[in-house]
Interface confidence: low
């Protein structure tokens, strides 16, 4: 088992991730492990040495590259906050704000919008991952009710008047809950005269 | 139709601070970003900084020691107080609504405070 | 910070005929996203500013058609195809890309 750096004639390493082909001298050399750079490269008598990125800059994978890469924040101008803060393997993590979702995505979000609102008796069909997308509006589902214009609102179940010892004045609707009365006090009048029989 | 109405002209001694109020009518207030931009007499418009409606604010480099820009929701006002002030603070303070879901695209605008700084 | 230039600073115009104003910025207004970012506004005497034009090119709600918005990168021109007497002000453009957002020093319009 040959240690870097060896000899090679067909252009390719053994370990791709942790090595790779120096075309100068015909070799392969180790890769800078995540977190390092290449401080000085390789040469037929001495593998790469590699060295830690200064503060505020990050490597995330086995590299050749003699800078580490500047870790920048997350752009409120662009709706996103930050979820892990940067470090020497791994860039900032970033996602979009609370009531945003993801409308550019280039490797990683770099654009977040504002969710658009559910109107009245719709609901924000719930996704697998939050700010992967717009909402897209559902019907609140039989025996549910949603009475607001929002991005987040939640189809709630009508009110059942019997659990709380009343009686039905007005059936639930989508955008509204049941109605509920005292079951002695009298219907009012505007409603009274669907009751005759 | 959406409307901004702004607190009326303060005049303030230097090193005092100046709250100025803006109030959204006839629309929803949150998940809109707010910004604050002043006009000093005769002079071009500059960006004092941002609220957006779930509480994150960000400023102008050049004001953000002396700025703050808060909102009270359940009256939907936006709030700039800048303090420290000096004479240079003179100016024409708007607020102004974003476009949603874009950053900048002030599409409707406050009529304007005028606050004066002088001894 | 984003630094805006414009040109000219004053320009006298004679109604019914177009006008031009260039817009330029220090470094690129293209988002990867594929839109520009910037916008266009004008403060008419005595009143607070309006939004023109929105992302380069997108005409706000309410703005006349002669009004149009071009360029891409750091080059960028408001066109009024036929000026109207009511088109006097001073003509702003400002960058929204990055905070805090600049405007350009304005380009005064006025009747000839």
């Known amino acids: 088992q040959a240690v870097p750096p060896y000899a090679s004639e067909n252009q390719t390493c053994r370990d791709q991730e942790k090595e790779y082909y120096e075309p100068q001298h015909r070799i392969c050399c180790s890769r800078c492990p995540p977190g390092t750079y290449v401080s000085a490269k390789c040469s037929r008598i001495r593998d790469t040495v590699c060295a830690t990125c200064a503060e505020n800059s990050y490597n995330e994978h086995w590299n050749y590259l003699t800078i580490c890469q500047l870790c920048r924040p997350c752009d409120p101008v662009m709706g996103l906050e930050e979820i892990a803060p940067c470090t020497s393997k791994r860039k900032t993590q970033c996602r979009c704000q609370p009531g945003m979702f993801c409308a550019a995505w280039a490797l990683e979000c770099t654009h977040c919008e504002l969710l658009s609102d559910c109107p009245p008796g719709t609901e924000a069909e719930l996704k697998d991952e939050v700010g992967k997308g717009n909402n897209h509006c559902v019907p609140c589902k039989a025996g549910h009710f949603q009475n607001t214009s929002s991005p987040s609102a939640r189809c709630q179940p009508h009110t059942r008047c019997e659990n709380q010892g009343l009686v039905e004045a007005a059936p639930g609707t989508a955008q509204s809950d049941t109605t509920c009365k005292n079951p002695l006090e009298p219907l009012p009048p505007e409603m009274s005269g669907t009751m005759l029989m | 139709q959406v409307q901004l109405v702004q607190s009326g002209a303060e005049v303030k001694k230097p090193g005092s601070s100046v709250k100025v109020s803006c109030k959204a009518s006839?629309?929803?207030?949150?998940?809109?970003?707010w910004s604050w931009v002043r006009q000093a007499p005769g002079q071009g418009l500059e960006w004092m900084g941002r609220f957006y409606s779930g509480g994150s604010a960000n400023y102008n480099p050049s004001l953000k020691e002396r700025v703050t820009i808060t909102a009270d929701e359940s009256t939907s006002t936006a709030y700039m107080e800048l303090s420290s002030l000096r004479s240079e603070d003179t100016a024409v303070y708007y607020c102004?609504?974003?476009?949603?879901?874009?950053?900048?695209?002030?599409?409707?605008w406050g009529q304007g405070t005028l606050v004066t700084v002088s001894s | 910070d984003i630094v805006m230039t414009q040109s000219p600073l004053s320009l006298p115009v004679t109604p019914g005929e177009p006008a031009s104003i260039s817009c330029r910025s220090s470094q690129s207004l293209l988002h990867s996203n594929s839109y520009n970012y910037l916008d266009w506004y004008l403060q008419k005497p005595g009143q607070s500013p309006q939004l023109l034009i929105y992302?380069?090119?997108y005409r706000a709600s309410g703005v006349p058609d002669r009004f149009s918005g071009s360029g891409s990168g750091t080059d960028f021109t408001l066109k009024i195809s036929r000026v109207e007497a009511e088109d006097v002000g001073v003509y702003y453009c400002?960058?929204?890309?990055?905070?805090?957002?600049?405007f350009g020093p304005g380009t005064k319009v006025d009747i000839k």
């Open positions: 400002m960058q929204p890309l990055q905070t805090p957002f600049t």
């Open positions: 102004a609504r974003e476009r949603r879901g874009y950053s900048g695209g002030f599409e409707i």
């Open positions: 006839g629309g929803t207030f949150s998940s809109y970003f």
């Open positions: 992302l380069g090119s």
